[in-house]
């Protein structure tokens, strides 16, 4: 039975040209995290495998930095980066847990962070 929950940074906003940290955290389970995949709609951003290290997709290589931890730093933001991002936790023996983050990239300097929320 899957008992874990994923806590994410929730709905967040950031300024065009700036950077943002995408972060998820898996709690309430003793399952071992073997890998975390980061995806945006229909494409892969990155994979962090506990043993094999990081994979950064070539389309994001210049703008994505691994970490902190299992998170991902997205740099040089453009308005095209607005949208949904998913962290997919591969765990043993539970299986996969998915968290969702919505990022809005703003032209102005009034970007504010949204509240944290949980996805069971």
């Amino acid at each position: 039975m899957m008992t874990g929950t994923i806590e994410t940074t929730g709905n967040i906003s950031a300024e065009k040209g700036g950077s943002i940290i995408l972060q998820c955290h898996l709690s309430s389970t003793t399952a071992q995290v073997t890998q975390v995949n980061w995806e945006q709609q229909d494409q892969l951003l990155a994979i962090c495998n506990a043993d094999l290290g990081w994979h950064i997709s070539p389309s994001f290589k210049d703008r994505v930095a691994p970490g902190p931890g299992l998170g991902l730093t997205l740099q040089s933001l453009t308005v095209n980066d607005t949208g949904e991002y998913f962290c997919i936790y591969h765990t043993y023996p539970d299986g996969t847990y998915t968290g969702r983050i919505f990022l809005e990239v703003l032209e102005s300097s009034v970007a504010e962070h949204g509240a944290r929320f949980q996805i069971p």
């Epitope: 995949n37 892969l44 094999l52 994979h55 691994p66």
Partner: antibody, heavy 119, light 107 residues
Framework: QVQLVQSGAEVVKPGASVKISCKTS????????MHWVKQAPGQRLEWIGG????????RNNQKFKGRATLTVDTSASTAYMELSSLRSEDSAVYYC????????????WGQGTLVTVSS | DIQMTQSPSSLSTSVGDRVTITCKAS??????VVWYQQKPGKAPKLLIY???YRYTGVPSRFSGSGSGTDFTFTISSVQPEDFATYYC?????????FGQGTKLEIK
């Protein structure tokens, strides 16, 4: 230039073990993960596992768990795979292959080592 | 484990023809797909990754596309040196898995 040179062909008896080496040159050994891939006659390629020479962490295909041991000697820039409790279906060509820096695509491969399990 | 199924398993074609190979994953693999070429007695060679980027030195006649579960590999105009076996592979989750291969033969 990047090179991966594997040890020579082996003929081994069922139940025995074999240890294959993969000597690398032309790049910083600790920066790239090393993988091992099996190709039995007429079969698809099969990923055995990978090892990160920098931290020693390795991930194995459960199918080979307990029988395939991946190790590295960083001072010699060499990766090893030991396969134990050999059976006839282990007869195959085994390749080492390196994946890129922060990239999982296997961009350089060794020439392959033929292992024949026969009594 | 994620199963990768290629079609067709073999293909007879002529020099200059356009060839398309498909690869279907048993579950979502996003864009974590790679294509290799292998000639008899030789190690596989990386051609396409992620899944539309040509590896260094790979001719422009080779291309790839797809996302999710369905992927395509195309040779726009087959050359004599292209007769070989082609494999797709996913690295979305371990164990990494390969398709069964597509053998490109001379008609």
């Amino acid at each position: 230039q990047v090179q991966l040179v594997q040890s020579g062909a082996e003929v081994v008896k069922p139940g025995a073990s074999v240890k294959i080496s993969c000597k690398t040159s032309g790049y910083t050994f600790t920066e790239n993960t090393m993988h091992w891939v099996k190709q039995a006659p007429g079969q698809r390629l099969e990923w055995i596992g990978g090892i990160n020479p920098n931290q020693g962490g390795n991930r194995n295909n459960q199918k080979f768990k307990g029988r395939a041991t991946l190790t590295v000697d960083t001072s010699a820039s060499t990766a090893y795979m030991e396969l134990s409790s050999l059976r006839s279906e282990d007869s195959a060509v085994y390749y080492c292959a390196r994946s890129g820096l922060r990239d999982y695509a296997m961009d350089y491969w060794g020439q392959g080592t033929l292992v024949t399990v026969s009594s | 484990d994620i199963q990768m199924t290629q079609s067709p398993s073999s293909l007879s074609t002529s020099v200059g023809d356009r060839v398309t190979i498909t690869c279907k994953a048993s579950q979502h693999v996003s864009t974590a797909v790679v294509w290799y070429q292998q000639k008899p007695g030789k190690a596989p060679k990386l051609l396409i990754y992620s899944p539309s980027y040509r590896y260094t030195g790979v001719p422009s006649r080779f291309s790839g596309s797809g996302s999710g579960t369905d992927f395509t590999f195309t040779i726009s105009s087959v050359q004599p040196e292209d007769f070989a076996t082609y494999y797709c592979q996913q690295h979305y989750s371990t164990p990494w898995t390969f398709g069964q291969g597509t053998k490109l033969e001379i008609k």
